[in-house]
Each structure stands twice: as C-alpha cells, then as structure tokens.
C-alpha cells in the first residue's frame, strides 16, 4: 500500500481475541454517515458479540451497530465528528474490549467511478479522466488519488501516479505500442480528514496503437 495509508487504531496496541478495525464513510447516503467494523481475526465466534459506540454523538449517548454476516455497521446522521468516540465489543452488558477513536481519522472514501481513457492522436498521449462523488460532499472534499496502470500481461507490475485532480495525461512514448493496458484509480483523504484508501474503481481497458514503421511513430488505434 502507499505511505498515505494511516491507522486510526494505533493508540490501542493491545491485541486480544476481540481486536477489531473500523472505518468511517461520511455523507455516504445523502447526509447519513456510516461506520463499519470487523474483527481482525476472521475466525472469532461472533454469535453473541455486539458493537456499541458512545460519545461524540448528537442527541444520544450511545448507538448499537447492526450486523451483516461478519461485519458490523451503523448508518446515522448523529456523528458529531468532533472528539473521540468509544467503540466497544460487548456480550450483553459486559464490554470485552474498547477503543477510543476519532471518526475523522479513519475515513475511507467512496471508490472513484466513470474512469475512461481517450487517445489524442495529434498530441500523442492518452487523457485519463474519472469522477468522484466527493466533489459534491460537504466534509471529505479534498482527496489524493492513486492511478495505477499495467500492461495486461504483467500480472503485478503496476505503475502508480498520485494526483489531486481527476485528470491525468499519459504520454504515448511511455507505453508499449500495440499492447493492452488495464487502469484503475482509488482515493484517500488528503486534508484535515485522515484514513484509508478507498476501494479501487472498476478497471478500464485500452489498447495502444501500433508503431508506424516508416516514421517510428504509433499508428492511431
């Protein structure tokens, strides 16, 4: 992963059977925020285990999480987004383990979308554009994006480019001619909010032009 990734849970170094990780997503459904948690050990028996968040909430003292298979989540407008909340794993009324977390430090943005690549014959380059729902958001507006591309035959040889805008130009001479490429993009908070990389966007696939033998230039696609 990248040096941008940060762990909002570092202050709780104690690892036991019930250690867990969480991420928040702000304005993920209109004005609703979400908080998603899971046990770090996938084999924990979660049958009677519940999650609860208390503190730094609006109008209520605590909220209970809903459970979906192995994950726990809340969707609410009631996060204050100032100060730390206490998130606890509980069996009945008994807390097994708790973490104090500032929800603004564990933000995972939504994945970018509408990724596309257009070849400009005259300029001998490829213009990469994509969209992000965060342009319309009130809170997490400023993101760093990681565009990754590879020749399809090179399984794990990704080239990464970090950028703050949603447009990137790839020079034709930097790519192999007559080759199939896969490209994808993800985002991470980059101003005030901290957290984790988003999921990758859906991949876009494109082919580079052939080389024109007489001039040594690529033929258009």
């Amino acid at each position: 992963e990248s040096g941008y990734a940060q762990n909002g849970d570092l202050e709780d170094a104690e690892l036991d059977d019930y250690s867990f990780s969480c991420y928040s997503q702000l304005e993920v459904n209109g004005s609703q925020h979400s908080l998603t948690c899971a046990f770090e050990d996938p084999d924990v028996n979660i049958t009677n285990l519940e999650f609860e968040i208390c503190g730094a909430l609006v109008e209520v003292k605590c909220l209970n999480f809903r459970k979906l298979q192995e994950i726990y989540f809340i969707e609410t407008k009631k996060f204050l987004l100032i100060g730390k909340s206490n998130i606890c794993v509980k069996v009945g009324e008994k807390s097994l383990t708790c973490k104090k977390i500032d929800l603004t430090t564990i933000v995972k943005p939504e994945a970018p979308f509408d990724l596309s690549v257009v070849y400009r014959e005259g300029a001998n380059d490829f213009v990469v554009t994509f969209n992000t729902s965060h342009l319309q958001k009130k809170y997490v507006k400023v993101l760093m994006h990681d565009v990754a591309y590879r020749q399809e035959k090179d399984e794990n040889k990704w080239t990464h480019v970090n950028l703050s805008s949603t447009k990137l130009t790839l020079l034709q001479r930097k790519l192999q001619p007559a080759a199939m490429y896969e490209i994808k993009v993800r985002s991470i908070p980059d101003h005030y909010f901290k957290g984790f990389w988003s999921e990758w966007s859906p991949s876009y696939y494109f082919r580079t032009p052939e080389i024109n033998n007489s001039s040594g230039e690529m033929d258009p696609i």
């Epitope: 993920v28 459904n29 979400s34 998603t36 899971a38 979906l68 298979q69 192995e70 994950i71 939504e110 994945a111 999921e199 990758w200």
Partner: nanobody
Framework: QVQLVESGGGLVQPGGSLRLSCATS????????MTWYRQAPGKTREFVAA???????TYAESVKGRFTISRDNAKNTMDLQMDGLKPEDTAVYYC???WGGGLNRAPFDYWGQGTQVTVSS
Amino acid sequence: QVQLVESGGGLVQPGGSLRLSCATSGSIFSLATMTWYRQAPGKTREFVAAITWRGAATYAESVKGRFTISRDNAKNTMDLQMDGLKPEDTAVYYCNVKWGGGLNRAPFDYWGQGTQVTVSS
C-alpha cells in the same frame, strides 16, 4: 480458492431480456464489491455495472436504464437483469469480486469464466 460461476447467458432477440447470475463457491468478505464486465469479439474488456455491499450501484453509460444489478449479501450472489437488449450487447459477460484490503482482510480479485450473451434476430 474461491470460484465464481456465471449463469443465465444465451441467445435472445433484440428487445428481449436475460438475467445473469454470479454465484461464489466459498465464503467471501461481505464488504467486497461485485462487478460485471463484458468482452465482445475483437474488443477490449469493458465495465458494465458494479454494486457495493450496501447496494450502491454504478453503471456504464451504454447500459443505464436497461440493466439492473442486484446482490444478495447472505448468499454472496449477484444478478444482472438485462432488458431492452441490443445486438451491441453481444459479448462474454464476466463476474468479478474484489476487495482492496483493510479491516485486516487481504486484498483479493476473483474472476469467473464468463457466460456468452448473443443478441440477434
């Protein structure tokens, strides 16, 4: 190793409908994004539709208003309802399940073998 199996492809007339399904052979992390891609003969693979665990869907411009993606988190399955099919929808349709990492789960990227959809009169 998780296997993805697509079904529901076939031959259909223009304007007709098909429903593709994608089933996973094993347990996958519930937060994984599920995606449909397609590849027509001689063309590059292209994105069709994706759905997150909470049901947020995105579509390629070419299928908006005609295709509907859905998923069942309890069964780890995904469907693609395709209405108003056109000859240009002819392709092999692939199911993809992806998790980028985090929450102490390793990243994964699983693909199905594909199911053929042919739209022709």
